[in-house]
């Protein structure tokens, strides 16, 4: 039979290669079948018999067509600061990502070694760059004509409302207060809105981290002034 319709195992033509989903076995010197994802080579091929495949055992997997003698072990269970976004199956490894509100601060070869909490932007500052799976939030001062009155890892600086008659002028941390006539929103400089995914809580949004193999965000109004830029009541 010509090589292109040969059944495995078969000897490749001189200088030729094996077909898709086949591999060249050095011992048998034949083109032999690979095993499909979720299986591994239980018995390697010989000159007269093809590869014998077997299913991966529990907690092991193969993701690609292969001829490995043993399936790969799935990663350990996700640590407490991570959530499982893909379960371990015979065909895929477990995937862990940092919890919502956290990001991967210290990565490892596959996935995340340590997750850390995302910073938030204080009133008067808005999110310049939202947190991602692997980076912290970046804040910026609200430009003139814009404000943020929240402590949040998602809220950007928003434009002050424009009043026909201003009762209280707005500042970086407070919107303008108008007299009873209806206000309008300005499109003040610096009020460019960050593209964000669909909201998952009230009117606030969270960055949606792309998963990684093993192990990236919030809000609300202060009750009075925001915490001081010092620290302790204990001195």
């Amino acid at each position: 039979l010509p090589a292109q319709v040969a059944f495995t195992p078969y000897a490749p033509e001189p200088g030729g290669t094996c077909r898709l989903r086949e591999y060249y076995d050095q011992t048998a010197q034949m083109c032999c079948s690979k095993c499909p994802p979720g299986q591994h080579a239980k018995v390697f091929c010989t000159k007269t018999s093809d590869t014998v495949c077997d299913s991966c055992e529990d907690s092991t997997y193969t993701q690609l067509w292969n001829w490995v003698p043993e399936c790969l072990s799935c990663g350990s269970r996700c640590s407490s600061d991570q959530v499982e976004t893909q379960a371990c199956t015979r065909e895929q490894n477990r995937i862990c990502t940092c919890r919502p509100g956290w990001y991967c601060a210290l990565s490892k070869q596959e996935g995340c070694r340590l997750c850390a909490q995302l910073r938030k932007c204080r009133p008067g500052f808005g999110v310049a760059r939202p947190g991602t799976e692997t980076s912290d939030v970046v804040c910026k001062p609200c430009a003139p004509g814009t404000f943020s009155n929240t402590t949040s890892s998602t809220d950007i600086c928003r434009p002050h409302q424009i009043c026909h008659v201003v009762a209280i002028p707005g500042n970086a941390s407070m919107d303008a207060v108008c007299t009873s006539t209806s206000p309008t929103r300005s499109m003040a400089p610096g009020a460019v809105h960050l593209p964000q995914p669909v909201s998952t809580r009230s009117q606030h949004t969270q960055p949606t981290p792309a998963p990684s193999t093993a192990p990236g965000t919030s809000f609300l109004l202060p009750v009075g002034p925001s915490p001081p830029a010092e620290g302790s009541t204990g001195d």
Epitope: D81, P100, A116, R122, P141, F219, P227
Partner: antibody, heavy 125, light 110 residues
């Protein structure tokens, strides 16, 4: 003025229970993650537990072993630490501590910038 | 679990001395480290965060350096009010944490 004030400490027998409170003024706990940190007499600081209100998540030091529960009453803007099965080695000053608010506009929950004055818990028969 | 080890556990120094305290993490924590000062009967006070950034209101004689596993707190010229205990802390407190703070370094008057 922004401050945290702990209360509820006192003398309790081994095996007993106690509930500590931490009342906040000037900040809304629902925006700010907050921890309990303790310090045994003459010893160092020891992180106990953390609550992240936005996501309803809690974390505990490995040695807590389910004996303590951290919780938050948003309506009272008060943090709690319910401590059960108390042992002599739980004797300590218990502090509530919140993240650091920097002058450059960040609130960073990884570090403790705001502390209460502490409340003493003594476990003894 | 990341373990934080401080050295020395105590030291004696005089006003005007340059004082250096070290903190070693059991694994790489990049720059996620803070330093605190605590005086007897008082709550701790944040001095340095992210290994080298000075917290608001902290005198410039305090400085922090290091990354990875080895960190240093330096007081360039010790003042009378600096006699206290100093602690380092890593920024990864979660349910797999046990040791978050170092054991402390007591700075005493010589």
């Amino acid at each position: 003025e922004v401050q945290l004030v702990e209360s509820g400490g006192g003398l309790v027998q081994p095996g007993g229970s106690l509930r500590l409170s931490c009342a906040a003024s000037g900040i809304d706990f629902s925006s700010y993650g907050i921890s309990w940190v303790r310090q045994a007499p003459g010893k160092g600081l020891e992180w106990v537990a953390y609550i992240y209100p936005d996501y309803g998540s809690t974390d505990y030091a490995t040695w807590v072993n389910g004996r303590f529960t951290i919780s938050l009453d948003n309506s009272k803007n008060t943090l709690y630490l319910q401590m059960n099965s108390l042992r002599a080695e739980d004797t300590a000053v218990y502090y509530c501590a919140s993240g650091y608010a920097s002058s450059s506009g960040y609130y960073d929950p990884k570090y403790f910038g705001l502390w209460g004055q502490g409340t003493l818990v003594t476990v003894s028969s | 679990d990341i373990q934080m080890t401080q050295s020395p556990s105590s030291l004696s120094a005089s006003v005007g001395d340059r004082v250096t305290i070290t903190c070693r993490a059991s694994e790489d924590i990049e720059s996620y480290l803070a330093w605190y000062q605590q005086k007897p009967g008082k709550a701790p006070k944040l001095l340095i965060y992210d290994a080298s950034d000075l917290a608001s209101g902290v005198p410039s004689r305090f400085s922090g350096s290091g990354s990875g596993t080895d960190f240093t707190l330096t007081i360039s010229s010790l003042q009378p009010e600096d006699f206290a205990t100093y602690y380092c802390q890593h920024g990864f407190y979660t349910s797999r944490s046990d040791s978050v703070f170092g054991g402390g370094t007591k700075v005493e008057i010589k």
